[in-house]
């Protein structure tokens, strides 16, 4: 951004910079921010057994130390190293279910398949889910009046970099067959520019995923026609066979009925195939 | 409709051998067609599967050793370099595609006799 | 993968008797599991889909049952018709056909 420039150009430090120049065009820190991470934290270790030995303090020092006193358009994946090693976890291969622009959905699957994980039920994707965060250079402040918008201001700040890296990690330790949801409603059903289609698909590794496969999710009552025919879901199948990983793709024609029938399977309409 | 595989007989090793199935009835352009394989006194072994799209997919085991093409009318499957542990008798199967559940999945519900393929030296 | 383990290998049963089949997905396969009657000399069978649907002709002492990950196939009222190989299969993704077939179940009807 032109901000960017600025400070990179005449190497001015933040504080001089008139107060005006510190409005971004994003919603500001969400309200109550540390206090919300650490009870998330502390929360989730509480319901998750192998994540018992966690110290949630240190968790949040480790997030705290990723964007606090750095200018909030030069965030590095590297600042958010110490964060991603406390938070390590695996996922049964098998289990690993990406989502693109459908994320309600795809949690509501997951809490009731319960041994199928998106990110956002691992620990660090759990802490972020829904929150917004920045800092402001050289001062020990959060900002609660804005934030860089990710268009409008640049794409290095503390949110995207964030789920930037916690994507790429959970891409990079699925293994087996994974999964993805991607929202049939859309015009684009796989866009290239989602955090899917620019950073999980590309850090899949060959040598541990034996497949993607896509559930292309309807959204009209009566959609019977096959979405998997669709030109994006051809061109996603183009990239995930070019990294020789096999692609399969599904509709889930219906997906109330669909949850349902993973919910309750002994349910007399889901009983008998057609 | 029906369903018949021919091309089945003695083979050297490493002599490809082009087994066809023939369908009758049977739109290729709307159901999916699988090669299933049995050894003698061994069980179902999936080859691999030529969508009514045209897409195909082969079991890991068998890509490289085998390549699946039709026509309007047959399905046929390469076997590219024959090996003794290719003895088998070869069907091809219809699969056919329901719903259920709110999404969908495939049955194998109409099979052929099956072609015996023997290697040996 | 969709690997498909079936127990037993091999079952006895008397004329009128009752044999459970069991076959286990590696993962959920979401009641797209079917089920194959084989007799020696024949091609197999289609006898059941969708977990517990009865194909065409199908008898109705056959039957098909559970969810997810685990599945049963259970004879009642055996008849000596029925002694066969039984073999599951998994139809939830037919992109992936490594051990898609369970390693089947010989019934011997004496």
């Known amino acids: 951004s032109g901000l960017n420039d600025i400070f990179e150009a005449q190497k001015i430090e933040w504080h001089e910079l008139p107060r005006w120049r510190q409005q971004w065009s994003g919603s500001g820190t969400t309200s109550r921010f540390p206090e919300t991470v650490l009870a998330r934290c502390v929360k989730y270790t509480e319901v998750h057994p192998e994540m018992r030995h966690v110290d949630c303090q240190s968790v949040w020092d480790a997030f705290k130390g990723a964007f606090i006193s750095k200018y909030p358009c030069n965030i590095t994946e590297e600042d958010y190293q110490p964060l991603v090693k406390l938070g390590t976890q695996t996922v049964p291969c098998n289990k690993t279910l990406l989502w693109s622009r459908i994320k309600d959905l795809a949690h509501q699957f997951t809490q009731v398949q319960r041994d199928m994980f998106t990110l956002e039920d691992m620990l660090l994707g759990y802490l972020a889910d829904d929150l917004t965060w920045c800092g402001e250079f050289n001062t020990f402040e959060i900002n609660y009046q804005s934030c860089p918008d990710w268009r409008k201001d640049c794409s290095n700040n503390p949110v995207s970099v964030f789920w930037k890296t916690v994507s790429r990690r959970f891409a990079e330790t699925a293994c087996g067959v994974v999964h993805v949801m991607l929202n049939g409603s859309r015009s684009k059903i796989f866009d290239k520019n989602s955090t899917f289609g620019s950073v999980e698909v590309h850090n899949l590794q060959p040598e541990k995923v034996q497949a993607l496969e896509a559930w292309v999710i309807h959204g009209g009552r009566e959609d019977s026609r096959d979405l998997c025919q669709d030109p994006t879901i051809k061109e996603l199948e183009s990239i995930i066979s070019k990294r020789n990983i096999r692609f399969f793709c599904k509709n889930i024609y219906r997906p109330d009925k669909f949850l349902q029938c993973v919910k309750n399977p002994e349910d007399s309409s889901c009983l008998s195939g057609i | 409709q029906s369903v018949e595989e021919s091309g089945g007989r003695l083979v050297t090793p490493g002599t490809p051998l082009t087994l066809t199935c023939t369908v009758s009835g049977i739109d290729l352009n709307s159901y999916a067609m699988g090669w299933v394989r049995q050894a003698p006194g061994k069980g179902l072994k999936y080859i691999g599967i030529m969508t009514s799209g045209g897409n195909i997919y082969y079991a890991n085991w068998a890509k490289g050793r085998f390549t699946i093409s039709k026509t309007s009318t047959t399905v046929d499957l390469r076997i590219t370099s024959p090996t003794t542990e290719d003895t088998a008798t070869y069907f091809c199967?219809?699969?056919?595609?329901?719903?259920?559940?709110?999404?969908?999945?495939?049955?194998?519900?109409?099979w052929g006799q099956g072609t015996l393929v023997t290697v040996s030296s | 993968a969709y690997d498909m383990t079936q127990t037993p290998a091999s079952v006895e049963a008397a004329v009128g008797g009752t044999v459970t089949i069991k076959c286990q997905a590696s993962q959920s396969i979401y009641n797209f599991l079917n089920w194959y009657q084989q007799k020696p000399g024949q091609p197999p069978k289609l006898l059941i889909y969708y977990a517990s649907t009865l194909a065409f002709g199908v008898p109705s002492r056959f039957k098909g049952s559970g969810s997810g990950t685990e599945y049963t196939l259970t004879i009642s009222g055996v008849e000596s018709a029925d002694a066969a190989t039984y073999y599951c299969?998994?139809?939830?993704?037919?992109?992936?056909?490594?051990?898609?077939f369970g390693g089947g179940t010989e019934v011997v009807v004496k």
């Open positions: 299969q998994q139809g939830w993704n037919s992109g992936i056909l490594d051990n898609s």
């Open positions: 199967a219809r699969e056919r595609e329901f719903y259920g559940g709110g999404t969908s999945g495939s049955r194998l519900d109409l």
